[in-house]
């Protein structure tokens, strides 16, 4: 997250983290149900773990945290690498969630966010694109939803329904490290970090996020039937 | 199948400008999950990374030559460029251009598809 | 910069043997940002391994990376008669440099 701020302690307790090997963040995800993530489905990788409940970078234990395996991870149908549409993945986790203050699914949003609707992206990702600086806690950062047309001015031809362009003035933006995190609008799950420019925080290159809203039914159709 | 070639002029004085051209085939530049770089080796030496173009046009220099270099796209021919001036024999070398992937995950992916490399000689 | 030194300079081993190349970083490096390069004579370098342990797509599995920090190794198994060849370490944690390379020759 580039020119955000440190996320207040458990204020984001659906983020999660997934790890290569020991403790290597290379995604965020997001807690949807007591035993299901989402992420973007260009966060991939056979073998990973989750964190869950934990507010700083480093692997220190934290006592909120829980840690998972994934046992399935199901990327959207309509998914191909390396294009962005429909990039979002289920990850299904070995067990289920012991509920707590730290840790705690969010609700989906059934309706599209609108142009101008404030929301919070949130992730472990750099805090400066060119040279890489990773902080120390999660870091929070509004962001506004922008109108589809800005979004397509901003990347032509590369604009579908799956996603949406959210940011603000020049210096904000999600980053590298980001990717699969939420983008949460009044209280709900609206998007996750997907795509966008590089470096990050350009001017009229916004961040392009998994446009959730139009998911919803494939997502709970995938859960139930596994 | 992705493939890229390098062109340009074998032999280049030493002050004059270095004028290479990579010609991307099988795929399109215009992409938001790749970028394109140029990397150079030296007769019998290591490689060096010169620098990188994203899909805006925005461009990533290696400090070392960053007031010597400029790299540029052609999306209509889908081409990229690469322009090195005041060039010395130390500017000798083997140059090659390259595609890497890049995304908002954490992840470098490295460059996986390489051109064949074209030989540039600085002499008078 | 962040400089990367390879070492040993030059393996001499025999085919069917395990090599063990080493790439030390002058600062620490986040593993997710380094990469392994193979060169044969006269050919570009092929990628390997990214993210310090990830096979590259067709990279055959006796080929693995490891490492954290400031050190980091690219193992190959059992060398076949084709992996003879030089290997190039890279760092893009920072401005992207490569290590002087190690050359894997027959013995």
């Known amino acids: 997250i580039v020119n955000g701020s440190d996320c207040q302690k458990d204020a984001q307790p659906w983020q999660g983290a997934l790890l290569l090997g020991p403790n290597k963040l290379y995604c965020g995800a997001v807690l949807i149900s007591p035993q299901w993530l989402l992420t973007a489905a260009h966060c991939r990788k056979p073998v990973f773990r989750i964190r869950l409940g934990h507010h700083s970078m480093s692997p220190v234990y934290e006592s909120g945290q829980q840690m998972f395996q994934g046992i399935k991870s199901i990327p959207h149908p309509g998914y191909s690498h390396p294009g962005h549409s429909n990039d979002l993945m289920l990850i299904k986790m070995n067990r289920k969630i012991r509920d707590s203050h730290s840790v705690k699914p969010v609700e989906i949003a059934c309706d599209c966010a609108t142009e101008g609707t404030r929301c919070m992206v949130s992730g472990w990702g750099t805090t400066s694109s060119s040279h890489n600086n990773f902080p120390k806690v999660l870091q929070c950062l509004n962001i506004t939803v922008l109108s589809e047309e800005r979004c397509k001015n901003s990347y032509p031809g590369q604009i579908d329904k799956t996603m949406f362009c959210a940011g603000d003035e020049e210096g904000r933006d999600s980053c590298q490290g980001d990717s699969g995190g939420p983008v949460v609008c009044n209280g709900k799950l609206q998007g996750l970090v997907s795509w966008g420019d590089f470096p990050c925080a350009q001017r009229n290159r916004p961040g392009v996020y998994t446009n959730l809203c139009e998911f919803v039914k494939w997502i709970k159709d995938t859960m139930n039937s596994n | 199948q992705l493939q890229l070639q390098e062109s340009g002029p074998g032999l280049v004085k030493p002050s004059e400008t270095l004028s290479l051209t990579c010609t991307v085939s099988?795929?399109?530049?215009?992409?938001?999950?790749?970028?394109w770089a140029w990397i150079r080796q030296p007769p019998g030496k290591g490689l060096e990374w010169i620098g990188n173009i994203y899909y805006s046009g925005s461009t990533y220099y290696n400090p070392s030559l960053k007031s010597r270099v400029t790299i540029s796209v052609d999306t209509s021919k889908n081409q990229f460029s690469l322009k090195l001036s005041s060039v010395t024999a130390a500017d000798t070398a083997v140059y090659y251009c390259?595609?890497?992937?890049?995304?908002?995950?954490?992840?470098?992916?490295?460059?996986?598809?390489w051109g064949q490399g074209t030989t540039v000689t600085v002499s008078s | 910069e962040i400089v990367l030194t390879q070492s040993p300079g030059t393996l001499s081993l025999s085919p069917g043997e395990r090599a063990t190349l080493s790439c030390r970083a002058s600062?620490?490096?986040?593993?997710?940002?380094l990469a392994w390069y193979q060169q044969k004579p006269g050919q570009a370098p092929r990628l390997l391994i990214y993210?310090?342990?990830s096979r590259a797509t067709g990279i055959p599995d006796r080929f693995s990376g490891s490492g954290s920090g400031t050190d980091f190794t690219l193992t190959i198994s059992r060398l076949e008669p084709e992996d003879f060849a030089v290997y190039y370490c890279q760092q893009a944690f920072s401005s992207p440099t490569f290590g002087g390379g190690t050359k894997v020759e027959i013995k």
């Open positions: 390259a595609r890497g992937e890049y995304d908002r995950s954490a992840l470098y992916y490295g460059m996986d598809v």
């Open positions: 099988g795929g399109s530049i215009p992409s938001s999950s790749y970028y």
């Open positions: 993210g310090a342990s």
């Open positions: 600062q620490s490096v986040s593993s997710s940002y």
